[in-house]
């Protein structure tokens, strides 16, 4: 990621100025973007940024607000990048197991499952 | 899902399933499948259920493999549908803003974040 | 930054059970497996196994299944490697390293543990 | 479990000599080897992973090559502090197993 900061600096600075810009954001009353129901917000990173944009996009830019909205961007390649590394490396089937087991242990244990 | 057990029972079930057939499973050594490098695993069920999809079509099926594919498929329906909640609801700026907040939140406590 | 630091030398009688730690500092412990690697005097290394703190799930080199056994303890962000039924062929340095990533490469290794077995 | 075949076992070389160790593995790892430094007392130091790739610290000097089974390392200009043994590391498939060691000493 082309920024001086570490992700996480970079994301406590954006949940700062979040909070600084609340009330500008809101402005536009009329505005509704898709908000996902559940809390397994890593599945919905595609639908968050695509908010993003369109709140963007409706924002008067000027100040931090660009700040806010350019960090914002920087989050999103980040995830970008973490997604590539998904599928770039080709292990052998045990590897395989191993992690799928790990994925399935946290599905078990940190997700928000519904019955 | 047209499954009569809940989910999570579902995924502890496939858990002890894994574990059981991990001899059969392997017994490919030539295959190669995408493992992803990070523990962020939401951001990889694509690349998780493809490998699946790898395994599925080079192992012997029959006896309780087949229910291991079975669960797996039906874990990834429910995956699916989750994924799907991720864009239904259209909701005003503030609502979006306060699930922005806490994705940030998640993002800032809960995920692997390399520097 | 990130370190991972060992505990001190051992003597053991053969027989016997030695358990090493390895602390972790400078990082979130559970987002990168441990491995155990030894190294006999004047010889190679051999890799023991491994162990993800994220899920408690280790794996171990045939060779050393049954004796060797790897835990974390998360809340101190510190990894143990436990040797039981000890020989005079486990003599040896004993390092934990990190994985960078899933299955990766070692990027930080421990300063090592020398454990003698002796009579 | 795959072997890591190391030549040579050891060698004689001056500063700014060019510096050549290979490895071959007993079947195809593809590129998922690392190339590792040990020093005298030391504890070990990954200089290169998979197959190529330098880490971060590590001068440009070393560099590595190969894929499948046959791999090397070179040392363009060999540098006192360098003059140490050389692992090669296949973490391809469990278990993960090492080459013998090429210990560089100075001539």
């Known amino acids: 990621i082309p920024t001086e900061i570490p992700t996480s600096a970079l994301v406590k600075e954006t949940l700062a100025l979040l909070s600084t810009h609340r009330t500008l954001l809101i402005a536009n009353e009329t505005l509704r973007i898709p908000v996902p129901v559940h809390k397994n917000h890593q599945l919905c990173t595609e639908e968050i940024f695509q908010g993003i944009g369109t709140l963007e996009s409706q924002t008067v830019q000027g100040g931090t607000v660009e700040r806010l909205f350019k960090n914002l961007s920087l989050i999103k390649k980040y995830i970008d990048g973490q997604k590539k590394k998904c599928g770039e490396e080709r292990r052998r089937v045990n590897q395989f197991l191993d992690y799928l087991q790990e994925f399935l242990g946290v599905m078990n244990t940190a997700w928000i499952i519904e019955s | 899902i047209p499954t009569e057990i809940p989910t999570s029972a579902l995924v502890k079930e496939t858990l002890a399933l894994l574990s059981t057939h991990r001899t059969l499973l392997i017994a490919n050594e030539t295959l190669r499948i995408p493992v992803p490098v990070h523990k962020n695993h939401q951001l990889c069920t694509e690349e998780i259920f493809q490998g699946i999809g790898t395994l599925e079509s080079q192992t012997v099926q029959g006896g309780t493999v087949e229910r291991l594919f079975k669960n797996l498929s039906l874990i990834k329906k429910y995956i699916d549908g989750q994924k799907k909640k991720c864009g239904e609801e259209r909701r005003r700026v503030n609502q979006f803003l306060d699930y922005l907040q806490e994705f940030l939140g998640v993002m800032n406590t809960a995920w692997i974040i390399e520097s | 930054q990130v370190q991972l630091v060992q505990s001190g030398a051992e003597v053991k009688k053969p027989g016997a059970s030695v358990k090493v730690s390895c602390k972790a500092s400078?990082?979130?412990?559970?987002?990168?497996?441990i491995n155990w690697v030894r190294q006999a005097p004047g010889q190679g290394l051999e890799w023991i196994g491994y162990?993800?703190?994220?899920?408690?799930?280790?794996r171990y080199n045939q060779k050393f299944k049954g004796r060797a056994t790897l835990t974390v303890d998360k809340s101190t962000s510190t990894a143990y490697m436990e040797l039981s039924s000890l020989r005079s062929e486990d003599t040896a340095v004993y390092y934990c390293?990190?994985?960078?990533?899933?299955?990766?490469?070692?990027?930080?290794w421990g300063q090592g543990t020398l454990v003698t077995v002796s009579s | 479990d795959i072997q890591m075949t190391q030549s040579p076992s050891s060698l004689s070389a001056s500063v700014g000599d060019r510096v050549t160790i290979t490895c071959k593995a007993s079947?195809?790892?593809?590129?998922?080897l690392s190339w590792i430094q040990q020093k005298p007392g030391k504890a070990p130091k990954t200089l290169i992973h998979?197959?190529?790739r330098l880490i971060d610290g590590v001068p440009s000097r070393f560099s590595g090559s190969g894929s499948g089974q046959d791999f090397t390392l070179t040392i363009s200009s060999l540098q006192p502090e360098d003059f140490a043994t050389y692992y090669c590391?296949?973490?391809?498939?469990?278990?993960?197993?090492f080459g013998q060691g090429t210990k560089v000493e100075i001539k």
């Open positions: 162990i993800n703190p994220y899920n408690d799930y280790s």
């Open positions: 390293a990190r994985d960078y990533g899933n299955f990766w490469y070692f990027d930080v």
């Open positions: 400078g990082y979130t412990f559970t987002n990168h497996h």
């Open positions: 998979r197959a190529d």
């Open positions: 590391l296949q973490y391809d498939d469990f278990p993960y197993t």
């Open positions: 079947q195809d790892i593809n590129s998922y």
